[in-house]
């Protein structure tokens, strides 16, 4: 059976201040090394502890960076890619792709490029909603009779 | 998950030369970062070298520099450490080291904290 994964993708700015010890994660990716398959983008494998970026907490191991001070890093070396991290300065801007696993289930694994992945809380919470409403208004009908 | 097996240590003249290999699993081997340290008695362990995944860039401590050789064999999972010139201060145990990808900071920042996998150590004594 196919597990079905739903994903809530959300973009974020991050600024980050260089500590002492540099901004604190490491990288995977590029076009010459990549690491998630059908995908030369450059994301985040680790984050050191009590680094730059462990101590601000937005930035997540698996995050996806799409830009660096304004600079899109499609396309680029994995080297290419560490010297523009290496170089960015005392005060960096990511821009990061953040994906939440939203639920898993027994349907047929649909690509993260399909537009009908709609992450399964945006249903269920309207359908709750809306039973909530209709149960209160079934009280109310009752009370009235 | 990486495991790494250190190997080259031994007993060598003040002046000589001896080559480390360390020889890792793991599939993905050109994903991770390398590096050596050593601890001499008494000391922290300290860093000496490392290697990018690609092999395309490299980092050595000011004490080593000139004189040690950080390469990589990613056909054969190993990467080696050349050092020449050998001083009685050189002797220590010498560790390699793995963690996965590319750290965003340049060398001179390295310590133990920046990697997750290590080997069991080789001693290397200069006399």
């Known amino acids: 059976m196919n597990g079905r994964v739903d994903y809530l993708v959300t973009e974020e700015e991050i600024n980050l201040t260089r500590g002492p010890s540099g901004l604190g994660f490491n990288i995977v990716g590029g076009t010459d090394q990549q690491y998630v398959s059908n995908d030369s983008g450059i994301y985040v494998s680790r984050i050191k502890e009590n680094g730059a970026a462990a101590l601000d907490g937005r930035l997540q191991e698996g995050d996806k960076i799409l830009s660096v001070n304004g600079q899109d890093l499609k396309n680029l070396l994995h080297q290419d890619a560490v010297d523009l991290f290496r170089n960015a300065g005392y005060a960096v801007s990511l821009r990061v792709q953040h994906r939440l696993q939203v639920q898993n289930g027994p349907i047929g694994h649909r690509g993260e490029g399909d537009p009908s992945g709609i992450p399964i809380f945006m249903v269920l919470v309207p359908v709750f909603a809306l039973t909530m409403v209709a149960a209160w208004a079934f009280m109310r009908y009752r009370q009235q009779l | 998950q990486v495991q790494l097996v250190e190997s080259g240590g031994g007993l060598v003249q003040a002046g000589g030369s001896l080559r480390l290999s360390c020889a890792a699993s793991?599939?993905?081997?050109?994903?991770?970062?390398m590096g050596w340290f050593h601890q001499a008695p008494g000391k922290e362990c300290e860093f000496v070298a490392e290697?990018?995944?690609?092999?395309?860039?490299?980092g050595y401590a000011d004490s080593v520099k000139g004189r040690f050789t950080i390469s990589r064999d990613n056909a054969k999972n190993t990467v080696y450490l050349q050092m020449n010139s050998l001083k009685p201060e050189d002797t220590a145990v010498y560790y390699c080291?793995?963690?996965?990808?590319?750290?965003?900071?340049?060398?001179?920042?390295?310590?133990?904290?920046?990697?997750?996998?290590w080997g069991q150590g080789t001693q290397v004594t200069v006399s």
């Open positions: 793991g599939r993905t081997f050109s994903s991770y970062t």
């Open positions: 080291a793995a963690v996965i990808g590319s750290p965003t900071d340049s060398s001179d920042y390295r310590s133990s904290l920046d990697y997750d996998y």
């Open positions: 290697i990018s995944g690609t092999g395309g860039n490299t």
